[in-house]
């Protein structure tokens, strides 16, 4: 028995057709993606293949401004024009609160939502019950499928899930649901989840009875033969697994941002074990043509993106210095404010030892394009933002080495004095430079906000310890020449979209007026 | 809406066999198991079996199994339940239920059918 | 197989009184429990599923709890209507399983 498995993951909001960066379409013969390009590929899909399902392996929220403006309800509504068979909670599907889950999204979906490692409890469980499931048995075809979910257990660190969820061990809560699948003589399970590419492995692996990942979260890219566009596979498409009871798991994920349409055919026995599989992601490019009722659809509800984005988030009364001429060359109130936006967006008072886990902030001065001028009424709009933040990138959370950090901070002024974008603004944090040194050595004080203290203080940075950092996407990934902090990472997690936290940050304040304050000093 | 209608009162003797049908409307047939839950008089319940309609896959009570068969009809979205080898003690009401294949609680229920062993 | 232990067997109670029936369950059986009610001579009725999920139509006063192995059915304030008896049932591990009944009276 033929099974087609059709996947997405980390869509992160782009409803509409992407460039190849997977940012704001520009010419549209060259995009990429969109609901209405993916609708296409599945129907063709569908029409010629028996038995096929179609899953999503979380985060469909936050990303651009579709998810500012309709707040998932898109993401319902599109996901159930697609008819989606099943979706798994991922951590930013929380960004909003468990309200800003269960009304727009689990109340809406016409598919089950999964997560076997959530469990709710006090007020919030009887209003939340039955509207995710740890699993669903879906009939394909003469045969049935259970499918598992489970959801990142950082994600109270990484979104906003509130007081009342627990986030369990993935394998721990597995198990027992997979055991439960067995029971009801379910003997063709798939593990659909967002706990990123390492833990698909490790559930592969551990996890008695699943017989195939679908992942998400770490944006992994698998590939057999030559890839199609620009992203580099980080191994074959599917990635086998061998569990400890010595059967083969594939284990799949298919990049991110709707850019390509995970394509996975397994082959079962009638004892419902894998014999083979095989596949490849499909990219999603403009040979494959919109599907012209999704596409008059996402242009009705795009009608109200373009209102938005004119409408006041906020005022500033000073001028908010986002210039090259500052940004790149000293520490710029444009800056700050975007710094002081990510780390408030990171508040998460988790354990009574820390007032957060996270306080500190990097930001490379090239990703700040415009400055705002404060005499147009002091008006803030997502326009003037999307001048400012222009390439749509996040705001991710990483774990660094104190040595890694140093590193980051000597690069940042390697060749000062050029314009060159890799000069570093902060928050939570203090450096001293001293440009007479010779480049590599050119950092004389590194002091950084305590986390682990009631009352915030600046402390010198230790190099062997391990701090948590707010930065772009862009630094993540060693943009900019910050190779270091890519090849010496010890965890990223995908943010929130870069203008969406300022955005937010501004609306909540109301009334901003950054301040240069000394957090960059040159001796 | 909803409904789960089965056939009528039976008396059966001792070692015979009886078959109760149960039809189904209101709902997709195919989507969900109808389960049989006995109930003898003034007694408690006792869950027998199920059958997925959707593609014949049956769940026993390993207590019945060898004495009952669950066949089904989707061309008339009926159920059947035919209980062999009857003794006096299978004198109950046999009731049919709708449940999710995949969480098996009951949520319809069918009126019951009263199977009287009596020699 | 499960057993699901339900208790009192009977009690008797009136009108406004908040009545708790308990089902022990005898391993964990991960909250898939539900809850029905039966009066003489009709086919049960399912009140709740999932320990606390209230079935559409079932009033606000019949609420559940518990984890684990313990489960408890709570009837806020009893009515009229409410006089019948109760069964719990397990859906974690076939066979599927019944408590034996609580028989509600009226005192």
């Known amino acids: 028995w033929e099974l087609t498995i059709l996947h997405t993951n980390d869509v992160h909001s782009r409803l509409e057709q992407t460039s190849e960066d997977s940012s704001k379409c520009v010419n549209a013969s060259r995009c990429m993606g969109g609901v209405a390009r993916l609708f296409t590929k599945v129907q063709q899909i569908r029409r010629a293949e028996p038995n096929v399902l179609l899953l999503d392996a979380g985060d469909q929220y936050q990303g651009t401004i579709w998810f500012t403006v309709y707040k998932g309800a898109e993401v319902a509504h599109f996901m159930n024009a697609l008819r989606y068979d099943a979706m798994a909670l991922g951590n930013h599907e929380f960004d909003n609160g468990v309200e800003g889950l269960i009304e727009p999204l689990l109340k809406e979906a016409k598919f089950p939502i999964l997560s076997a490692n959530i469990k709710a409890k006090g007020p919030l469980a009887s209003q939340i019950s039955g509207l995710y499931l740890p699993y669903k048995v879906l009939p394909v075809g003469d045969e049935v499928v259970g499918i598992v979910g489970y959801t990142s257990k950082e994600t109270p660190f990484l979104s906003n899930p509130g007081t009342n969820l627990v986030f369990e061990d993935e394998i721990t809560a597995l198990q027992p649901e997979v055991d439960k699948l067995k029971t009801l003589n379910v003997n063709k399970i798939i593990a659909l989840g967002h706990s990123g590419f390492e833990m698909d492995k490790l559930i592969a692996q551990k996890v008695r009875g699943v017989d195939v990942v679908v992942g998400g979260h770490s944006n992994t890219f698998l590939y057999t033969g030559n890839p199609p566009s620009k992203e580099v596979p980080a191994g074959k498409y599917p990635f086998i697994v061998t569990s400890d009871d010595g059967r083969k798991v594939p284990v799949v994920q298919a990049y991110a941002f709707g850019k390509y349409l995970g394509y996975l055919k397994i082959e079962f026995d009638e004892r419902g074990n894998v014999i083979s599989s095989h596949g490849n992601p499909i990219l999603l490019n403009s040979s494959i043509p919109e599907d012209p009722s999704i596409k008059a659809d996402i242009n009705k509800w795009r009608i109200k993106l373009d209102n938005y984005s004119t409408q006041e988030l906020g005022k500033t009364i000073v001028y908010l210095d986002g210039s090259s001429q500052s940004c790149r060359f000293r520490e710029c109130n444009m800056g700050n404010l975007i710094c002081d936006a990510m780390i408030n967006n990171n508040l998460r008072h988790t354990d009574e030892m820390f007032w957060n886990h996270v306080s500190m902030c990097i930001l490379n001065g090239g990703g700040i394009r415009s400055p705002i001028d404060e005499r147009n009424n002091g008006t803030i709009t997502w326009e003037n933002l999307a001048a400012v933040l222009p390439f749509g990138g996040t705001f991710d959370l990483v774990q660094l080495k104190g040595s890694t950090l140093k590193k980051a901070f000597e690069h940042s002024v390697h060749r000062y004095g050029q314009s060159t974008g890799e000069f570093l603004q902060v928050g939570g944090i203090h450096v001293v430079y001293d440009l007479s040194r010779k480049p590599g050595d050119r950092v004389v004080k590194l002091d950084v906000l305590c986390t682990k203290c009631r009352v915030p203080s600046y402390d010198p940075l230790k190099m062997d310890e391990v701090y948590k950092v707010i930065l772009p996407n862009f630094l993540a990934n060693g943009g900019d020449g910050f190779q270091m902090i890519k090849d010496e990472l010890l965890r990223h997690d995908s943010g929130d979209q870069d203008i969406n936290v300022v955005s937010t940050y501004i609306s909540k304040m109301k009334v901003i007026y950054p301040a240069v304050e000394g957090r960059i000093k040159f001796s | 809406q909803v409904q789960l209608v089965q056939s009528g009162a039976e008396v059966k003797k001792p070692g015979a066999s009886v078959k109760v049908s149960c039809k189904a409307s209101g709902y997709t047939f195919t989507t969900y198991n109808i389960h049989w839950v006995r109930q003898a008089p003034g007694q408690g319940l006792e869950w027998m079996g199920a059958?997925?309609?959707?593609?014949?896959?049956?769940s026993y009570n390993q207590k019945f199994k060898g004495r009952v068969t669950m066949t089904v009809d989707t061309s008339t979205s009926t159920v059947y339940m035919e209980l062999s080898s009857l003794r006096s003690e299978d004198t109950a009401v046999y009731y049919c239920?709708?449940?999710?294949?995949?969480?098996?609680?009951?949520?319809?229920w069918g009126q019951g059918t009263l199977v009287t062993v009596s020699s | 197989d499960i057993q699901m232990t339900q208790s009192p067997s009977s009690l008797s109670a009136s009108v406004g009184d908040r009545v708790t029936i308990t089902c022990k369950a005898s391993?964990?059986?991960?909250?898939?429990l539900a809850w029905y009610q039966q009066k003489p001579g009709k086919a049960p009725k399912l009140l709740l599923s999932g320990v606390i999920s209230l079935e559409t139509g079932v009033p606000s006063r019949f609420s559940g709890s518990g984890s684990g192995k313990d489960y408890t059915l709570t009837i806020s304030s009893l009515q009229p209507e409410d006089f019948a008896t109760y069964y719990c049932?397990?859906?974690?591990?076939?066979?599927?399983?019944f408590g034996g009944g609580t028989k509600v009276e009226i005192k």
């Open positions: 059958i997925f309609p959707g593609n014949g896959h049956i």
């Open positions: 239920a709708r449940g999710d294949y995949d969480e098996s609680y009951f949520d319809y």
């Open positions: 049932q397990q859906y974690w591990s076939i066979p599927w399983t």
């Open positions: 391993e964990g059986i991960y909250n898939r």
